[in-house]
């Protein structure tokens, strides 16, 4: 029995594959209960997390992970080095960064051990499953009387991510949000000198190096305005 | 908007030359990667050569008959081919990347490393 799954993290065209064995009439085989289905995220491209709801099995089952990666110079299979556990049952697996090629096809194959023809086989496009690290060191500097520009940095991916700037002021009920490609950097052409404001940022590895769709953490919100703006209105600390 | 504009295709008995260009517009040549990749019928587009960075990368069939160049004034790529042989027969692609040849793993010729393709321009190489 061949099932598609359709992911919510752009790798639709992952296929798992679920092996029957035959079975009385009266009761299903183990062999045909579905396995977790893995869901795998790189975190700044530093490490990579798979993982699975160890919960949804009948009984406890320490399921085990193997990985490859199709048509490529690594398609030997791997098993998991290190586990991740839940309540002393395996629930995921992290690889490391050299384990990991972004631009290759990642094959992860789940199986529990008791019932070796009781596996499951996903593939995933790695560079749409990267997730980086919240913006950092966020700065905010006076272009003029009523303009502000907003700074921030990035470990290591730069120009590989797109941005989504928030902000606020004290008397507003939502965040007014706006798209900044990779030149990270935010100008707020008119700012009203009797209000503060907040804002936050948070960061996306799309679509020069990859087509991810989760975002980073927002960053910490940095603030400016009312008591700090009259205090010194060219020094801007961040703010946790 | 990313372009990549393939040329210098073309027929040619075994043993010619050609020397293929790619002129790209909208993308600065840096540390980036820059790559030809084929396709013959029937069979799966393969790299071809790769540059960036000061580095060349070339798949074992081209070795010391293909060269890959680039010139950044003109914001082209080119690719000499010599010795050439009907086994070369294929359309030819030019493509490019926003990150460097062997960044986050894997190889210089994975294709989901590069994110702009051109239309490609076709070589035939007869016996």
């Known amino acids: 029995l061949n099932t598609t799954i359709l992911t919510p993290n752009g790798n639709e065209d992952a296929t798992t594959d679920f092996f029957l064995t035959s079975m009385p009439t009266d009761s299903l085989s183990v062999s045909t209960l579905p396995l977790p289905e893995v869901q795998c995220f790189v975190f700044n491209v530093e490490y990579m997390n798979c993982t699975w709801n160890s919960s949804s099995e009948p009984q406890p089952t320490n399921l085990t992970l193997h990985y490859w990666y199709k048509n490529s110079d690594n398609d030997k299979v791997q098993k998991c080095s290190h586990y991740l556990f839940s309540e002393e049952i395996t629930s995921g697996c992290q690889l490391q960064k050299k384990e990991i090629h972004l631009y290759q096809t990642f094959v992860v194959q789940l199986q529990d051990p008791r019932e070796p023809r009781r596996q499951a086989t996903q593939m995933l496009k790695l560079q749409n499953l990267v997730i980086p690290w919240a913006p950092e060191n966020l700065t905010l500097r006076k272009l003029s009387e009523s303009q502000l520009e907003l700074n921030w940095n990035n470990r290591f991916l730069n120009h590989c991510l797109e941005h989504l700037v928030q902000y606020r002021t004290d008397w507003d009920h939502s965040w007014t949000e706006q798209s900044v490609d990779y030149r990270h950097k935010f100008s707020l052409p008119s700012v009203d000198g009797q209000k503060r404001y907040t804002f936050r940022v948070r960061s996306r590895f799309n679509p020069l190096c990859g087509s991810a769709q989760h975002w980073s953490e927002w960053s910490h919100p940095i603030h400016w305005g009312s008591n700090s703006s009259k205090e010194n209105p060219f020094l801007f600390a961040l703010e946790a | 908007q990313v372009q990549l504009q393939e040329s210098g295709g073309g027929s040619v008995q075994a043993g010619g030359s050609l020397r293929l260009s790619c002129v790209a517009s909208?993308?600065?040549?840096?540390?980036?990667?820059m790559g030809w990749f084929r396709q013959a019928p029937g069979k799966e587009r393969e790299g071809v050569a790769a540059?960036?960075?000061?580095?060349?990368y070339y798949a074992d069939s081209v070795k010391g008959r293909f060269t890959i160049s680039q010139d950044n004034a003109k914001n082209t790529l080119y690719l000499q081919m010599n010795s050439l042989k009907p086994e070369d027969t294929a359309m030819y692609y030019c493509a490019a990347a926003w990150v460097a040849c062997l960044e986050f793993g894997g190889s210089w010729y994975d294709l989901a490393r590069y994110k702009h393709w051109g239309q490609g321009t076709q070589v035939t190489v007869s016996s």
């Open positions: 540059l960036g960075g000061g580095s060349t």
């Open positions: 909208g993308y600065t040549f840096s540390s980036y990667c």
